[in-house]
């Protein structure tokens, strides 16, 4: 797995550098959580041709990922820090049980889809830190979530390899919304 | 092969508007990360950042044009349009389209047009 | 909005020479600062990304650093086709700001 963020040799070799802010330290951990998700990628696109897969709109029924809209105060008309900021940890804790579902889907990556799924936990702390508005923040229910993730897991092995695809082509999009806003509060 | 091309005007009169399009190939707007930005260049000067549109349809202006700038993608024709209204002898420039696509929007124009001079 | 300035706004020197130019940032920009060169008539190139990473194809005698608010470009064993305008970019935030340029003379 790769080394978490503020352990990098460029950390190391500056130790004059001042201690990251809070905005630092969310942009660095969203590019560590993008480096993981290129790694999965790498190894979904090379195992399967899912990839290149124009069926795609097949599967994205079953799923309800999170994604930005310009209602979500995220975009530059109509931006707005913390009902952006409330869209993007909501999304993240419903991203979550998609990231459980990862687990057990890669063969030589498991440990890199562990850190993908530790990280985001720390993103989603570090974010909920920065919000002034918890209570307009809604968590997932459990139960639907368990219901969710044995549903996922009942899919025949093609739809199993689609899913896997569309969660990280989702999560990446989302995750880049994320870092764009952030960058503009 | 990535490329792109400024097409439109060269000469426009005074308060009318310029209409520039930008043609590429070799990339999708439709690719998350990926977004396509316009620039221009007053001779002999430096570079001015005008506008910036994202494969989600999110658009970023220059704050001082702001007023005068739109710009628009159709993703199934692979164009990107930027209008400037109420021309000005001051914006006679060479004007470039460029894109910007990686993971981490580092917002760095990677592949330019050969840009179009507008007087 | 960031400003970012250049210095020097020119220079000169002799092929084989090493040269460094600086950017700094009105305010921490991280390491989303990029550079380009341009050779007059021509769009601008990108060289440096994200501070210090050489663009695909760009020659090793090139070499970005710094982080938060100041930046340097330096070219080692110049060559006549380094001559042309340098600027560098804020790309952390919009607007999208450039620096004036530093042009060198071969």
């Known amino acids: 797995a790769p080394v978490p963020p503020g352990e990098d040799s460029k950390d190391v070799a500056a130790p004059h550098r001042q201690p990251l802010t809070s905005s630092e330290r969310i942009d660095k951990q969203i590019r560590y959580i993008l480096d993981g998700i290129s790694a999965l990628r790498k190894e979904t696109c090379n195992k399967s041709n899912m990839c290149e897969s124009s069926k795609e709109a097949l599967a994205e029924n079953n799923l309800n990922l999170p994604k930005m809209a310009e209602k979500d105060g995220c975009f530059q008309s109509g931006f707005n820090e913390e009902t952006c900021l409330v869209k993007i940890i909501t999304g993240l804790l419903e991203f979550e049980v998609y990231l459980e579902y990862l687990q057990n889907r890669f063969e030589s990556s498991e440990e890199q889809a562990r850190a993908v799924q530790m990280s985001t936990k720390v993103l989603i702390q570090f974010l909920q830190k920065k919000a002034k508005n918890l209570d307009a923040i809604t968590t997932p229910d459990p139960t639907t979530n368990a219901s969710l993730l044995t549903k996922l897991q009942a899919q025949n092995q093609w739809l199993q390899d689609m899913t896997t695809h569309l969660i990280l082509r989702s999560f990446k999009e989302f995750l880049q919304s994320s870092l764009r806003a952030l960058r503009q509060m | 092969q990535v490329t792109l091309k400024e097409s439109g005007p060269t000469l426009v009169k005074p308060t009318q508007t310029l209409t520039l399009t930008c043609s590429f190939s070799?990339?999708?707007?439709?690719?998350?990360?990926?977004?396509v930005g316009w620039v221009r260049q007053p001779p002999g000067k430096a570079l001015e950042w005008l506008a910036f549109?994202?494969?989600?349809?999110?658009?970023y202006y220059s704050p001082s044009l702001e007023s005068r700038l739109t710009i628009t993608k159709d993703t199934s024709k692979n164009q990107v349009v930027l209008t400037m209204t109420n021309m000005d002898p001051v914006d006679t420039a060479t004007y470039y389209c460029a894109r910007s696509a990686d993971d981490y929007l580092y917002y760095s124009f990677d592949y330019w047009g050969q840009g179009t001079l507008v007087t | 909005d960031i400003q970012m300035t250049q210095s020097p706004s020119s220079l000169s020197a002799f092929v084989g020479d090493g040269v460094t130019m600086t950017c700094w940032a009105s305010q921490s920009i991280n390491d989303y600062l990029n550079w380009y060169h341009q050779r007059p008539g021509e769009a601008p190139e990108l060289l440096v990304f994200?501070?210090?990473n050489l663009q695909i194809g760009v020659p090793s005698r090139f070499r970005g650093s710094g982080s938060e608010t100041y930046f340097t470009l330096t070219i080692n064993s110049l060559q006549p086709e380094d001559s042309g305008t340098y600027f560098c970019q804020n790309g952390h935030s919009f607007p999208l700001t450039f620096g004036g340029g530093t042009k060198l003379e071969i």
């Open positions: 070799g990339f999708s707007l439709s690719t998350s990360g990926v977004g």
């Open positions: 994200a501070a210090s």
């Open positions: 549109i994202f494969w989600d349809d999110d658009k």
